[in-house]
């Protein structure tokens, strides 16, 4: 059986979101895919790769890159100078034509917050790191930090309590969160 | 205890296949990729694929496209990774290797199986 | 596929010692480099990932740097149970690849 669950995704502006949508190869590899936000009810498609699809040739739109790559199984997607009006849901989906569209797994919930200087993080640092807890801990939780913290053992009721150094959140009903450092 | 626990050690005949489990425990299985890296005697480490446990895709290398099948059974924790028509340069030590979260763009091995030796020998 | 250069194939410093490990990627791969250590008859292990982070419960006598096509990985004080072999490998295109490794030993 596979879960279907949001998967939430926390960025300071100008920092690049990349992720991986899988798909079965044997369906799907000269299939074209798209990016695409939810708005309301009615998805809009913001890029799509060509037909068929290629290795390594990526399809840039504006600060969107995709990459499909068919051998794999798989479509890199590359958000670069995240703002705060990028947050929202989005999803991978095989592009057939504007009415029909099959969505791979797992939509993405984008939340995009200025930076606690209003800047966006240094070029080096903001195109890095999705982070994870560490291995010594609940890795599904989700994020990796680079500052000093504790991670809790998510309760069987899915609430999951990310402790650092003075703050704490607690996310009901949210099946993941990676989180990527504040930038100072 | 987060950790990965691979199958023991085969011989086979050229031309024989092999299927090498990894059975995963302390984390959520379903929620980070499985990926198998092999590694001849003195040699480098190659990386022949992944897969999604979740879903059940999957995706090799093209070196071994049509030989290798990777798969798992999310009710006991564990994938698989057969690999067909075996030949004498398929003996390798073969790892399995937790990757990152399944849709994260992020592919670092943070935890190893102890790698399982296959001996292709006639 | 991009091709990883490691260099040197193979060193032997005193204990003590700063060590430094070079990989050359053949084209830019966007920071998405990472460090293994292997030490005989073990599984790799994870030191550092995207260039520079430090593994939890890596020691930091380790470090990684650099950038677009060239990076380097330190170990600032050689010790005993520094000897293995490194491995530094990249993720920003399929497939992954791999350095060819780096054996350091003890003089």
């Known amino acids: 059986t596979t879960e279907l669950t949001e998967e939430k995704y926390e960025y300071k502006e100008g920092q690049t979101l990349e992720v991986k949508c899988d798909y079965a190869l044997e369906k799907y590899a000269n299939s074209r895919k798209a990016w695409q936000k939810m708005e309301g009810k009615m998805p809009k498609i913001l890029a799509k790769t060509e037909r068929p699809s290629e290795n390594s040739h990526p399809v840039q739109v504006g600060r969107i890159t995709l990459e499909d790559y068919p051998d794999h199984g798989l479509l890199q997607v590359r958000m670069t100078n995240l703002q705060v009006e990028d947050s929202g849901l989005y999803q991978c989906v095989i592009y057939q034509h504007p009415k029909e569209s099959h969505v791979l797994f797992n939509p993405i919930c984008l939340v995009v917050t200025k930076g606690s200087s209003g800047t966006p993080g240094s070029s080096e640092n903001s195109t890095q790191n999705v982070y994870r807890t560490p291995s010594t801990t609940a890795k599904a939780l989700g994020p990796r930090y680079t500052s000093p913290r504790t991670v809790t053992q998510a309760p069987p009721e899915s609430t999951v309590v990310v402790s650092t150094p003075g703050s704490e959140i607690n996310l009901t009903n949210v099946t993941d969160i990676i989180r990527v450092p504040v930038f100072n | 205890q987060v950790q990965l626990v691979q199958s023991g050690a085969e011989v086979k005949k050229p031309g024989a296949s092999v299927k090498v489990s990894c059975k995963a425990s302390g984390y959520t299985f379903t929620r980070y990729d499985i990926n198998w890296v092999r590694q001849a005697t003195g040699q480098g480490l190659e990386w022949m694929g992944w897969l999604n446990p979740n879903s059940g895709n999957t995706g090799q290398t093209q070196k071994f496209r049509g030989r290798v099948t990777m798969t798992r059974n999310t009710s006991i924790n564990t994938a698989y990774m057969e690999l067909s028509s075996l030949r004498s340069e398929d003996t390798a030590v073969y790892y399995c290797?937790?990757?990152?979260?399944?849709?994260?763009?992020?592919?670092?091995?943070?935890?190893w199986g102890r790698g399982t030796l296959v001996t292709v020998s006639s | 596929d991009i091709q990883m250069t490691q260099s040197p194939s193979s060193l032997s410093a005193s204990v003590g010692d700063r060590v430094t490990i070079t990989c050359q990627a053949s084209q830019d791969i966007n920071n998405h480099l990472n460090w293994y250590q292997q030490k005989p008859g073990k599984a790799p292990k994870l030191l550092i990932y995207d260039v520079s982070n430090l593994e939890t419960g890596v020691p930091s006598s380790f470090s990684g740097s650099g950038c677009g096509t060239d990076f380097t990985f330190t170990i600032s004080s050689l010790q005993p149970e520094d000897i293995a072999t490194y491995f530094c490998q990249q993720y920003d295109k399929l497939p992954l690849t791999f350095g060819g490794g780096t054996k350091v030993e003890i003089e």
């Open positions: 290797a937790r990757g990152g979260y399944t849709s994260a763009w992020r592919w670092y091995f943070d935890l």
